[in-house]
């Protein structure tokens, strides 16, 4: 599986949209999770509602939103008021029983507005502190906050 | 900007020890993982040492070409990093690079120091 | 044991230019690293695919389990270096031998 690079600006909204084969997948959960490291557990953030016919009813954990479309095969997760600390490597993943199906892993980058400083270039990349964790940028180009991803099969 | 430097190279003797210390700033040091990384001179480059995070229990692994002879350890509260090598040999000669990986929220994004060179030599 | 292909190869302005990395056993991402003559490795390429800061578009990883490659489309000058694969899946973290990449 590609990786998908999407950016968002601190203090946004930035929406992930994963989609997948929706027969395939049909009655399965589906969760957005954080890779901790290279072989590390994928931290669970949020997953769709317990009852699958209910999906579709949007389910919060914290700042982060996830909602599922199960006929037509989208997921969608929406990280609102985006920090530093939310930069990583996120999964979508279809739930069945234990066992959990990547359907696709996506960088999460934090872009701090240029305009809150005034001396800034064409992008303003704060220093990491304890509270700001993931201020490193790690591409300048801009991108579309809001991503379909392909099926997966 | 973050930030490793490298110190503590120098002129050693067959047989001698030597102390690395690498200074971390401008990231949250704590919650990284930290590494060595060894290139001798016209050669490749070999990682030896890391040292995982607290949340991590500070777990240490080892390169087999040095782990008889290796320590590596880090002082959160100071963000500091450092190597001991003992019973130094002249292939032990090289440029010693500091490597933040692994650990914390960017565990994939890597930092590198400048290196610091140490010659083993009569 | 990671093994690069090829040790040393050369390559005019504006060619396509691909290198390989074929590791021993499956790991989960590779890592690329750009090393010039008196200066430390710079991070090229993580994540198998994701370019880091400063790199040109006109690098690309890529790659799955056992085979990973780096690839320059339209060559430059300023390309010339040792590129450096890294697992960091599992204890060794080794890194492959370099590919060297040369200017016609």
């Known amino acids: 599986l590609n990786t998908t690079v999407l950016q968002g600006m601190a203090g946004q909204s930035l929406r992930v949209s994963c989609t997948y084969d929706a027969l395939k997948h049909w009655g399965r959960r589906k969760a957005w999770c954080r890779q901790l490291g290279e072989e590390g557990p994928c931290q669970r953030v949020v997953s769709t509602h317990g009852v699958w016919l209910l999906a579709f009813l949007k389910k919060r954990n914290g700042s982060t939103v996830i909602a599922d479309d199960t006929l037509a095969g989208t997921v969608t997760i929406t990280l609102k008021n985006l920090q530093a600390g939310d930069a990583g490597l996120y999964q979508c993943q279809s739930l069945r029983g234990r066992e959990a199906e990547v359907l696709q892993k996506v960088l999460v980058e934090v872009l701090e507005d240029p305009l809150d400083d005034q001396d800034a270039g064409d992008l303003w990349v704060p220093e990491e502190s304890s509270s700001f964790e993931g201020a490193q940028v790690e591409h300048s180009t801009s991108r579309n906050q809001e991503t379909s991803f392909p099926p997966t099969s | 900007e973050v930030q490793l430097v490298e110190s503590g190279g120098g002129l050693v003797q067959p047989k001698g020890s030597l102390k690395l210390s690498c200074a971390a700033s401008g990231f949250s040091f704590n919650t990284y993982a930290m590494n060595w990384v060894r290139q001798a001179p016209g050669k490749g480059l070999e990682w030896i040492a890391r040292?995982?995070?607290?949340?991590?229990?500070?777990?240490?692994y080892y390169a087999d070409s040095v782990k008889d002879r290796i320590t590596c350890s880090r002082d959160d509260s100071e963000n500091m990093f450092y190597l001991q090598l003992s019973s130094l040999k002249t292939e032990d000669t090289a440029m010693y690079y500091c490597v933040r990986h692994g650990d914390g929220n960017l565990w994939y994004i890597d930092v590198w120091g400048t290196g610091t060179t140490v010659t083993v030599s009569t | 044991v990671l093994t690069q292909s090829p040790a040393l190869m050369s390559a005019s302005p504006g060619e396509k230019v691909t290198m390989t990395c074929s590791a021993s056993s499956s790991v989960s991402y590779m890592y690329w690293y750009q090393q010039k003559p008196r200066s430390s490795p710079k991070p090229w390429i993580y994540?198998?695919?994701i370019l880091a800061s400063g790199v040109p578009a006109r690098f690309s990883g890529s790659g799955s389990g056992t085979s990973y490659s780096l690839t320059i489309n339209n060559m430059e000058a300023e390309d010339a270096a040792t590129y450096y694969c890294q697992q960091w899946s599992f204890n060794p973290y080794t890194f492959g031998g370099g590919t060297k990449l040369v200017i016609k």
């Open positions: 040292i995982r995070s607290k949340s991590n229990n500070y777990a240490t």
């Open positions: 994540l198998t695919s």
